[in-house]
């Protein structure tokens, strides 16, 4: 049960992660403009990815695309590449999950493959949830990197008559999505990885004893009960009987490890 | 067409108080950016203040800060300007404009209410 | 503030002829996100209210007279009537539409010589 609680909690937190990854890459509001220098501009401006928009006091917003590739910097490039490799990797993720999920049966799946199927999702939750986490803050660096360039040459003067203010651009909304989002993957995929232990069948959960019977080769299993694990496993402390069947709500079915004689 | 019909002007002495209406019709008010702008007499334009279609923020000029304040009702299509604590040189002719969609300029105007302040 | 200084105070043209008014601003009216200049033109005939001609420092209003341009980037505006005519006897204001409070210009009169 708390197996199945926390594979199902990881999906669930890895989804709205991974939502929030796909938000942050599409929002416009990578970098907005700082108004400190002049909060009561009538024309403000902010940045994504993939466009740069101006919205005025009245209302009316216009935004441009990036119709370009080589014009653009690396940095930027670099960015958006890690945001969709984020993606990619956490849809893949998602779509992985689904079918580790241990309260989805699919068709006789043993549980060894959901395990591994469970484990596969987690470290690419984890791995997407890291690089949405540092596409993010490659660009919150550029951020500040450029912020206190253009502090340090805020006024320009012409003629010693007439100032040119440099427009001063500071974190916007989808930064902080795209850390929170990135945050949340990453969590996602470490209870999977959590859940995946609970599943995995273990190696040694008792010790098969050999009685060597002069006729019939006969295993006898001692005990009767199975041992419980950390992670979930038969906390009913269900009979296992000889005869191999399992009920069905069990948490594990393990291989049988017996000498025979 | 666009209509704004501006009101409440009038003669008041200093340190006195004056409530300005601008009647909108015509279009739909909710949606637009209101200014008031003054002009004295034999003088250019002044701007006053301007209230965003959404109430909020609002904005004024430093010789008004503080004295006169900016509102409107949508449900009324009405702008409001209250003049407080009213100086010789706030005497001029006070104009309603309509926020223009583009490049914050204003497309329509009042044909403007008079406001004299003397003793 | 931005401070709008608008040159000449009076100008006397012939009908037909060219008539140039300037403005500039003692800071840049330039926005780089969508590289626009917020500098606007408006027209004021006697006992009338002011009437939007121009936005964007080059933006024709609609219904405006295609007689009448703008020009000009940064901190340094024109208004140019390319062929004068009786009603455009007026004082013409530009105004600072970047950042608030808004200010005009000290208006420039044109009359016919």
């Known amino acids: 049960m708390a197996v199945t609680a926390c594979q199902g909690l990881g999906f669930v937190v890895s989804l709205i992660g991974i939502a929030g990854i796909i938000a942050a890459t599409c929002m416009d509001q990578w970098s907005t403009q700082d108004l400190y220098n002049n909060p009561v501009t009538a024309v403000f401006n902010y940045q994504g990815l993939w466009r740069s928009c101006v919205r005025e006091s009245s209302g009316f917003t216009e935004c441009r695309g990036y119709f370009t590739l080589l014009g653009l910097p690396a940095m930027l490039q670099a960015v958006r590449a890690l945001m969709i490799v984020g993606i990619v990797l956490g849809a893949i993720g998602l779509l992985v999950s689904i079918f580790a999920l241990k309260c989805i049966r699919i068709g006789s799946m043993e549980d060894s493959a959901k395990a591994n199927m469970t484990l596969t999702s987690g470290i690419m939750f984890i791995v997407s949830g890291l690089c949405a986490i540092a596409g993010v803050s490659v660009f919150a660096n550029m951020l500040v990197t450029n912020f206190w360039m253009s502090t340090a040459n805020m006024y320009t003067g012409m003629g010693g008559m007439v100032q040119t203010v440099q427009t001063r651009y500071t974190f916007g909304a989808a930064l902080f999505v795209g850390w929170v989002a990135g945050g949340l993957t990453l969590i996602g995929g470490v209870m999977m990885c959590i859940a995946c232990r609970g599943l995995a069948p273990e190696e040694t959960n008792y010790k098969a004893v050999s009685y060597h019977a002069s006729g019939h080769s006969v295993a006898y299993k001692p005990g009767g009960f199975k041992a419980s694990t950390g992670f979930g496993s038969n906390t009913k402390n269900k009979k296992i009987y000889d005869g191999g069947a399992r009920t069905e709500d069990e948490v594990q079915s393990y291989p049988s490890k017996h000498d025979y004689v | 067409e666009v209509q704004l019909v501006e009101s409440g002007g009038g003669l008041v002495q200093p340190g006195g108080s004056l409530r300005l209406s601008c009647a909108a019709s015509?279009?739909?008010?909710?949606?637009?950016?209101m200014h008031w702008v003054r002009q004295a007499p034999g003088k250019g334009l002044e701007w006053v203040s301007y209230?965003?279609?959404?109430?909020?923020?609002?904005y004024f000029t430093d010789t008004v800060k503080g004295r006169f304040t900016i509102s409107r009702d949508n449900a009324k299509n009405s702008l409001y300007l209250q003049m407080n604590s009213l100086r010789a040189e706030d005497t001029a002719v006070y104009y309603c404009?309509?926020?223009?969609?583009?490049?914050?300029?204003?497309?329509?105007w009042g044909q403007g209410t008079l406001v004299t302040v003397s003793s | 503030d931005i401070v709008m200084t608008q040159s000449p105070d009076s100008l006397a043209v012939s009908l037909g002829e060219r008539a140039t008014i300037n403005c500039r601003s003692s800071?840049?009216?330039?926005?780089?996100?969508?590289?626009?200049?917020?500098l606007t033109w408006y027209q004021q005939k006697p006992g009338q209210p002011p009437k939007l001609l121009i936005y964007?420092?080059?933006t024709r209003e609609s219904g405006v007279p295609d007689r009448f341009s703008g020009s000009g980037s940064g901190t340094d505006f024109t208004l140019t009537i390319s062929s004068l005519q009786a009603e455009d006897v007026a004082v013409y204001y530009c105004?600072?539409?970047?950042?608030?409070?808004?200010?005009f210009g000290g208006g420039t009169k044109l009359e016919i010589k």
């Open positions: 404009a309509r926020s223009s969609y583009y490049g914050n300029s204003m497309d329509y």
């Open positions: 800071q840049s009216l330039l926005n780089a996100g969508n590289r626009k200049n917020y």
């Open positions: 015509g279009f739909t008010f909710s949606t637009f950016g």
């Open positions: 209230i965003t279609s959404g109430e909020s923020p609002i």
């Open positions: 105004q600072n539409a970047y950042s608030y409070p808004f200010t």
């Open positions: 964007w420092a080059s």
